[in-house]
Interface confidence: low
């Protein structure tokens, strides 16, 4: 199936940059969001620190690490009460993501 320009293939995501102010090149303002074309039974999530389509059951059960949200080589841990996850780099630096 051929894709038109700007069309999303099923099961894929793209990062869309909004509000780009090109009139001030030294102070470019860019707000990024993700658009995903997920199949039935999937919803937007995070895999390898990028937007992706993930199994909806992961979100329902709050098993965030099942999305593989961290980068390759990082360790994933659920936060207490499953309110999000942490990604621990080999050097020990921790990035915490909470889900509202």
């Amino acid at each position: 199936q051929f894709l038109k320009e700007g069309q999303l293939a099923a099961g894929t995501c793209e990062i869309v940059t909004l509000d780009r102010d090109s009139s001030q090149p030294r102070r470019t303002i860019a707000r990024q969001t993700a658009r995903c074309a997920c199949r039935k039974g999937q919803i937007a999530g995070t895999t390898r620190n990028k937007p992706s389509c993930v199994d909806a059951r992961i979100i329902k059960t709050k098993q965030w690490c099942d999305m593989l949200p961290c980068l390759e080589g990082e360790g994933c841990d659920l936060l207490i009460n499953r309110s999000g996850w942490t990604c621990t780099q080999p050097g020990g630096r921790i990035k915490t993501t909470t889900v509202s």
Epitope: R35, C38, R39, Q42, I43, A44, A56, I59, V99
Partner: antibody, heavy 121, light 112 residues
């Protein structure tokens, strides 16, 4: 069981802003793309707009400036900024199953029962 | 702006007959169409998604077909409980302008 319920519909006078809310049970609103749809008495369905997990929104061309969709951790809200009598309708919130991609499985799998908004002097 | 032209606006059928409702999109929507049934005082319910996929729990007498810009909902062997209004919903998403969804005007199906 996964369900949606709308609230906030009532009689308002023209020009009085009104905010409707949609709450979910059985699933987490935060991970889903959500839409609002309305239906005037005896008329067909009209899509108003969609909100993404990031909070960004897209609207039908006729709805831009007339409606604002926003969300909290537990609700998806629809503000009718300056109601007119033409906005008298039942307003439904609906869950987008997965995502509305260009030409791929564009559909709403769960709908709320609707909330009636009447705009009258 | 996407336009979905749904025909006919209304129809009357006898139990057991085959009913067909057509939606014509103003552009190629790549099977991005779904079909809904709505009864008075109730919200719509999903019948078909992705042009031809039957939603779970929907009787198999309902089917969807079509491609490009031309799509059809077929009710094979219509039953009394199928009296309702039916809507198509078409959708396109461009990365530049976002998502645009449009409902057809609806088809009121009466069972004789």
């Amino acid at each position: 069981q996964e369900q949606l319920v709308e609230s906030g519909g009532r009689l308002v006078t023209p020009g009085t802003p009104l905010t409707l809310s949609c709450t979910a049970s059985g699933f987490f609103l935060s991970g889903y793309y959500m839409s609002w749809v309305r239906q005037a008495p005896g008329k067909g369905l009209e899509w108003i707009g969609i909100i993404y997990p990031s909070g960004s929104t897209d609207y039908a061309s006729w709805a831009k400036g007339r409606f604002t969709i926003s969300k909290t951790s537990t609700t998806v809200d629809l503000k009718i900024t300056t109601p007119t009598t033409e906005d008298t309708a039942t307003y439904f919130c609906a869950r987008v199953a997965g995502y509305v991609g260009y030409g791929y499985e564009t559909f709403f799998d769960i709908w709320g029962p609707g909330t009636l908004v009447t705009v009258s002097l | 702006e996407l336009v979905m032209t749904q025909t006919p606006p209304s129809l009357s059928a006898s139990v057991g007959e085959t009913v067909r409702i057509r939606c014509l999109a103003s552009e190629d929507i790549y099977s991005g169409i779904s079909w809904y049934q709505q009864k008075p005082g109730k919200p719509p319910t999903l019948l078909i998604y992705g042009a031809s996929n039957l939603e779970s729990g929907v009787p198999p007498r309902f089917s969807g077909s079509g491609s490009g810009s031309d799509y059809t909902l077929t009710i094979g062997g219509v039953q009394a409980e199928d009296a309702a209004t039916y809507y198509c919903l078409g959708g396109v998403t461009y990365s530049s302008t976002g998502t645009h969804l449009t409902f057809g005007a609806g088809t009121n199906v009466e069972i004789k």
